[in-house]
């Protein structure tokens, strides 16, 4: 199966052009949400709508792919858990962090467990 080339997409939308070179998705406001991706092929240019998810920081986007460890234990003090990601692949010109840390709130179930553990420790 042929893989999509970095920055290059065959056959742009509604076009006879052979190879379209697509830039990054640039949100219309701030650093996430709906935006546009510009493409060029010879003298032709096109803009297509795209979206950068708002729950990702910029370096977590399609430009940077990470391999993540399992989630750590719930921290009862902060009500969050953490996992680390190691860079797996970056778009050629993307300046990605080698490692990243992601936090998320614990589910009510794990939060309760963590609190119970914390309580036991105090006895």
């Amino acid at each position: 199966v042929a893989k999509k080339k970095d920055k290059v997409k065959k056959g742009g939308p509604g076009s006879e052009c052979a190879e379209w070179a697509w830039g990054p998705c640039t949100p219309s406001s701030k650093d996430c949400g709906v935006g546009f991706r510009e493409g060029t092929c010879g003298a032709q240019t096109q803009r297509i709508r795209c979206r950068v998810p708002c729950n990702w920081k910029k370096e977590f986007g399609a430009d940077c792919k990470y391999k993540f460890e399992n989630w750590g234990a719930c921290d009862g003090g902060t009500g969050t858990k953490v996992r680390q990601g190691t860079l797996k692949k970056a778009r050629y010109n993307a300046q990605c962090q080698e490692t990243i840390r992601v936090t998320k709130p614990c589910t009510p179930k794990t939060k309760a467990k963590a609190k119970a553990k914390k309580g036991k420790g105090k006895d």
Partner: antibody
Framework: QVQLVQSGGGLVKPGHSLRLSCAAS????????MNWVRQAPGKGLEWIGM????????ILNQKFKDKATLSVDIAKNSAYLQMNSLRAEDTAVYYC??????????WGQGTLVTVSS | EIVLTQSPATLSLSPGERATLSCRAS??????LHWYQQKPGQAPRLLIK???QSISGIPARFSGSGPGTDFTLTISSVEPEDFAVYYC?????????FGGGTKLEIK
């Protein structure tokens, strides 16, 4: 820090093939694009293509589409350049380099390929 | 493909002088332009990435400017070890291309 050690160069007859190796040591070989570049004697630098070890995605200079094949072996932390149907004008020093947009690149020492009968 | 034209082909300077090397792209390449130094028998060494970003371990006398189509590598005060060939390279689109090089030689 990544160290790249190249091997496989030498004297080869016209029409023959040759496989060059680029062995990486140090951090994260599989995370970065591996470029192959050549330099004919007394000439400038010419990009052959690149491959990403994580999924073997390959982007080849169309000039070399019938000449070069890129591959990787993650288990051996190595990248390979197979050159086919060699001609006198393929005589050059061949370099591999590991590219990260964030930290820059690391180059192998280069390996000389001489095509002559 | 994007053509990079370097000038001058040869630059003759004395140590201590300021060196200005030019690289012009055949079309806009944003800031996707890198500068390399190469000495005889050695692999190229990256000096500046993305037009003006410094590289760890490279002396501060090397600096770059851009973006767009016209790029400059400046060596504020040339040291004896700086005499070498300098190449620019673009990574804006495939194939990656290099300029023809500028040879910095001792006057």
């Amino acid at each position: 820090q990544v160290q790249l050690v190249q091997s496989g160069g030498g004297l080869v007859k016209p029409g023959h093939s040759l496989r060059l190796s680029c062995a990486a040591s140090g951090q994260s070989f599989s995370s970065y694009w591996m470029n192959w570049v050549r330099q004919a004697p007394g000439k400038g630098l010419e990009w052959i293509g690149m491959i990403h070890p994580s999924d073997s995605e390959t982007i080849l200079n169309q000039k070399f589409k019938d000449k070069a094949t890129l591959s990787v072996d993650i288990a051996k932390n190595s990248a390979y350049l197979q050159m086919n149907s060699l001609r006198a004008e393929d005589t050059a020093v061949y370099y591999c380099s590991s590219w990260s947009a964030k930290r820059g690149d690391f180059w192998g020492q280069g390996t000389l390929v001489t095509v002559s009968s | 493909e994007i053509v990079l034209t370097q000038s001058p082909a040869t630059l003759s300077l004395s140590p201590g002088e300021r060196a200005t090397l030019s690289c012009r792209a055949s079309e806009s390449i944003s800031n996707n332009l890198h500068w390399y130094q190469q000495k005889p028998g050695q692999a190229p060494r990256l000096l500046i990435k993305y037009a003006s970003q410094s590289i760890s371990g490279i002396p501060a006398r090397f600096s770059g400017s851009g973006p767009g189509t016209d790029f400059t590598l400046t060596i504020s005060s040339v040291e004896p070890e700086d005499f070498a060939v300098y190449y620019c390279q673009q990574s804006n689109s495939w194939p990656l291309t290099f300029g023809g090089g500028t040879k910095l030689e001792i006057k």
